[in-house]
């Protein structure tokens, strides 16, 4: 699986999970969140050559077909696999909330 | 949706629908499929600008982030969100087969 | 559960100004953003510009033309649009994602035309 376990230890130039620390404050202009500070939201990216962790069929074929035809510009992208929620501590007036703020973190990747 | 209905129909810079015509034997070097001769399998391109059908909290937080960011290369991608089946006839010596392959054909595309 | 209502549009020659004003209605709380998009005929919407607690982005067309102004005691969003183009008609829509949930207004035409 193409996740920190395998991409944070590989220097790897083809489609692999990256690290992004985002702060809210700094990086997004966001003060309203409590806690966390910020996190580990991660990306993807790198290059999908033939049958780098294909995801679908399709993929599959259009990876196959850059191959065949270099000069072709339909090649599959390097895209999230598994993402998991992250949970929130907020305040409305002086009452804190807290919330779980689905689909924030990048686990993997894959071409797609 | 980013779909051939809006795609085809609009020249779109952003994220869309393409239309690919795969010829097997010439595009993929695949002898063996008697029928059909090609089909059009479609990809998906386009740049992801903020908020451009953006897929997941995460692509939307990242689409954020890279407005507010420019200089980050941190960018969702632009990928297959509907797939059909292609349904193919071949042999087996003399013996026709039918067959459905799966996740073949790309209807409509989104930002990841 | 969020309401937003834009005012402020109209028809306007080219070169002039315009101010569009969202006024957002029920319990705002957790801004991921707020924002003015719009939509011309036959295209996608688009975003004209966006605003966080303390960050704004302008699309490139727009830049150092549109201004974008937030007041939250009021829960009020602006855009300030001078040297208006032919190429800035659309309808214009407000935009607030709380939690990581759209709101939209119904939108406001404006039409520059001489």
């Known amino acids: 699986a193409l996740d920190a376990a395998y991409c944070f230890r590989n220097v790897q130039d083809n489609c692999c999970l990256r690290p992004l620390y985002i702060d809210f404050k700094r990086d997004l202009g966001w003060k309203w969140i409590h806690e966390p500070k910020g996190y580990n939201a991660n990306f993807c990216a790198g290059a999908c050559p033939y049958l780098w962790s294909s995801d679908t069929q399709h993929s599959r074929v259009l990876s196959l077909y850059n191959t065949i035809n270099p000069e072709a510009s339909a090649s599959p992208c390097c895209v999230s696999q598994d993402l998991e929620p992250l949970t929130i501590l907020y305040y409305i007036g002086k009452t804190p909330k807290i919330e779980q703020l689905s689909n924030m973190i990048v686990k993997s990747c894959k071409c797609s | 949706a980013l779909d051939a209905a809006y795609c085809f129909r609009n020249v779109q810079d952003n994220c869309c629908l393409r239309p690919l015509y795969i010829d097997f034997k010439r595009d993929l070097g695949w002898k063996w499929i008697h029928e059909p001769k090609g089909y059009n399998a479609n990809f998906c391109a386009g740049a992801c600008p903020y908020l451009w059908s953006s897929d997941t909290q995460h692509s939307r937080v990242l689409s954020l982030y890279n407005t507010i960011n420019p200089e980050a290369s941190a960018s969702p991608c632009c990928v297959s969100q509907d797939l059909e089946p292609l349904t193919i006839l071949y042999y087996i010596g003399k013996t026709p087969k039918i067959e459905q392959l799966s996740n073949m054909i790309v209807k409509s595309c989104k930002c990841s | 559960q969020v309401q937003l209502v834009e005012s402020g549009g109209g028809l306007v020659q080219p070169g002039e100004s315009l101010r569009l004003s969202c006024t957002a209605s029920?319990?705002?709380?957790?801004?991921?953003?707020m924002g003015w998009f719009r939509q011309a005929p036959g295209k996608q919407r688009d975003m004209v510009a966006i605003?966080?607690?303390?960050?704004?982005s302008y699309a490139d067309s727009v830049k150092g033309r549109f201004t974008i102004s937030r007041d939250n005691a009021k829960n009020t969003l602006a855009l300030q649009m001078n040297s208006l183009k032919p190429e800035d008609t659309a309808v214009y829509f407000c935009?607030?994602?709380?939690?990581?949930?759209?709101?939209w207004g119904p939108g406001t035409q404006v039409t520059v035309s001489s």
């Open positions: 935009n607030l994602n709380q939690l990581g949930t759209d709101y």
């Open positions: 029920g319990s705002i709380f957790g801004v991921f953003y």
């Open positions: 605003s966080t607690d303390d960050r704004t």
